[in-house]
Interface confidence: medium
């Protein structure tokens, strides 16, 4: 978080600097500004025609404006006092990504159980304090997403937390005390997701030195795929500022950013059902694991139960999944029906079962990869068949695939982003089914969205249990 570039000059100039200055102080400020903009705003210095510090064209000015706009300064396009002060301020070394909050390329973890390992410990703090700060930092993000983090002590973790000094093998050398404090890499294999903290800093549990918890919250944001926010209240704002860690909260922008990647916590995650007892049907927080039509009925799956609703009738009944299909597991995660074939497909983890005429087919479960999913897809969140197109839509995290049931193969050009092609529907869908010839009903937590696929927009927002006359 609190990154400083190596300062070419400690002093800052006063007033606005035109870009044709010739004094050594102003030259140094321009050189410093260049390097700052190169590092954080993608200025390509080799494309700047320079003659005695004179810049032709507007490339440098445009980058200064971009930086001023992003960091909330008055936009002047000049290296004025406030701009130079901001350039010298403690900040994160990850480049500033513009109005979209994700990292460039938008990588995300394609699973919700993520491991981390603390590779080594700073001598500045007790080991227990380091463990606690890192655990609490991960908890900040798990509180607002479906993500679950677990610490492992040996083996390959998704996110490696490292304390290192100077050059440490990633081509992003630390620069001693007071310079770059930490950096992190977006989700991916190998170094992807890893968070590095400069050992030359003095790490603390309080406001002195550099607070490890606050820095880790920011860096873990990067590890999860977030870029920088232009909201000064956000933990993902580029510059570091100590806040009371006892009252620390993510800003609305941080939450919006992370939930745009992973969705919000599922209701049954926030409100666990430890004894797996029958959920209350009219609980306003009720969510479902999977929903599908079966003939003229709608099946709502939750834990080891399902509710059966006959279309257009208020009466519903609850049953154990095992009472109808003893060979099927609890916790069905996705389901869809091809009514013309009297087939229902049920999914859990990386397996699926085929039900024909309400009877499980032999030789199942089979792997979901037989549909043509890539290996990184480990589970399906939701699925729905559209008989008009004879296509099945599979929703996985923030993406969806489209499967041609006639040709028994995935359509080309997928996956696509849910948010791009289902206007108003966020990522991470719990369940979906198709009804009344033109509506998809999307379930997210305790909310349900009636989506007209012809108009391509949400036409109604309902509670998930609205089908039961609650």
């Amino acid at each position: 978080m609190k990154f400083l570039l190596i300062l070419l000059l400690q002093a800052t100039a006063s007033g606005a600097l035109p870009l044709n200055s010739s004094t050594s102080l102003e030259k140094n400020n321009v050189l410093f500004g260049e390097r700052y903009l190169e590092k954080f705003y993608g200025l390509e210095i080799n494309k700047l025609p320079v003659t005695k510090m004179k810049y032709s064209g507007n490339l440098m000015k445009e980058k200064i404006q971009e930086m001023q706009h992003f960091l909330g300064l008055k936009v002047t396009g000049q290296l004025d006092t406030s701009t130079l002060e901001m350039m010298h301020a403690p900040r994160c070394g990850v480049p500033d990504v513009h109005h979209f909050r994700e990292m460039p390329g938008g990588p995300v973890w394609r699973k919700h159980y993520i491991t981390y390992r603390i590779n080594n410990y700073t001598p500045d703090m007790n080991r227990e304090d380091v463990d606690y700060a890192i655990r609490k930092a991960f908890q900040v993000w798990s509180n607002v997403t479906p993500l679950k983090f677990s610490k492992i002590n040996t083996g390959m973790a998704d996110i490696l937390v490292v304390f290192a000094r100077g050059a440490h093998g990633d081509f992003h050398a630390f620069d001693g005390k007071g310079g770059i404090l930490a950096h992190a890499f977006g989700p991916g294999s190998g170094i992807g997701g890893d968070a590095h903290f400069d050992e030359d800093e003095f790490w603390t549990t309080h406001s002195g030195g550099t607070n490890l918890f606050l820095t880790a919250v920011h860096e873990i944001g990067h590890s999860l795929g977030l870029g920088h926010s232009s909201d000064p209240k956000a933990v993902m704002f580029p510059t570091y500022k100590y806040v009371d860690i006892n009252t620390f909260r993510l800003s609305a922008d941080d939450i919006r950013g992370i939930q745009s990647l992973y969705g919000d916590p599922k209701e049954n995650q926030r409100l666990p059902n430890p004894d797996n007892s029958e959920p209350a049907l009219c609980d306003p927080n009720l969510s479902f694991d999977a929903v599908t039509t079966v003939g003229n009925k709608i099946f709502f799956f939750k834990d080891r139960f399902f509710w059966l609703k006959v279309s257009e009738r208020p009466k519903t009944s609850v049953n154990l999944i095992s009472s109808l299909w003893p060979t099927l597991p609890s916790g069905i995660e996705a389901a869809y029906e091809i009514e013309a074939r009297n087939q229902v497909f049920l999914f859990k983890d990386d397996k699926y079962w085929l039900i024909s005429n309400l009877r499980p087919e032999p030789n199942y479960p089979k792997s979901i990869h037989s549909f043509g999913f890539p290996n990184f897809v480990k589970k399906i969140d939701a699925a729905v068949f559209n008989p008009r197109f004879y296509r099945t839509y599979f929703f996985v995290d923030n993406q969806y695939w489209r499967y041609d049931e006639r040709r028994q193969m995935m359509d080309p050009g997928y996956p696509k982003l849910i948010t791009k092609n289902f206007q108003g529907i966020g990522p991470k869908i719990d369940a979906v089914f198709y009804s009344k010839n033109k509506y998809y009903y999307f379930f997210q937590g305790s909310n349900q969205f009636e989506y007209d696929f012809l108009l391509q927009r949400i036409t109604k927002t309902l509670k998930s249990n609205s089908w039961f006359g609650c």
Epitope: N58, K61, E62, Q65, E66, H69, F70, G72, K74, V75, T76, G77, H98, H99, F100, S229, S230, D231, P232, K233, A234, S251, A252, D253, R256, T419, Q423, G424, R457
Partner: antibody, heavy 124, light 108 residues
Framework: EVQLLESGGGLVQPGGSLRLSCAAS????????MTWVRQAPGKGLEWVSY????????VYADSVKGRFTISRDNSKNTLYLQMNSLRAEDTAVYYC?????????????????WGQGTTVTVSS | DIQMTQSPATLSLSPGERATLSCRAS??????LAWYQQKPGQAPRLLIY???NRATGIPARFSGSGSGTDFTLTISSLEPEDFAVYYC??????????FGGGTKVEIK
Amino acid sequence: EVQLLESGGGLVQPGGSLRLSCAASGFTFSWYEMTWVRQAPGKGLEWVSYIGPSGGRTVYADSVKGRFTISRDNSKNTLYLQMNSLRAEDTAVYYCALVSQGEISGLPYGMDVWGQGTTVTVSS
Amino acid sequence: DIQMTQSPATLSLSPGERATLSCRASQSVSSNLAWYQQKPGQAPRLLIYDASNRATGIPARFSGSGSGTDFTLTISSLEPEDFAVYYCQQRSNWPPLTFGGGTKVEIK
């Protein structure tokens, strides 16, 4: 269809207050910077206020600073302008507008979606 | 603050004629300039951004040019629906975002 619809205008006495709303539809409201622009009768356009996508950053014209507050509720796809201590010179049609940004730079390049406007009259 | 001055205040032309509208900034705004069209009783519409780029759906008869302090909006051949008020606006130095006073293009 991308749409902005203002409401809340009306006649108010000097020193009074009004709250304007701008309902957005047809686009992902929470991704975009928004702004209010006003136009006094028979006059030109005057920029009033700006708000960032999450609402965390707000900017005002000097003429309204300290009296007007811009805010947004992304869950309701709505932009607001709370106007206090109104003066006769605040009489105008108030437009909300979506600020488009360059895909590369992220800088605002123009206001390319506008509402139809709502009229505010400050008079005793 | 940067002042934007438009000229002429009124331009009287016939359909089919070429219209040339001018906008001058009190200091350089690079190419950070937009043009808007406003018809009576309607909201403004973005025509040109960054001095010379046409906004989505704007006909090719509209073009913008200039950089620094002097800018021009040209309508190559006026159509009946082009008679309106045109505003320029800078974003080079803000807040505030400033508009010009407008040029009214009226039927001769």
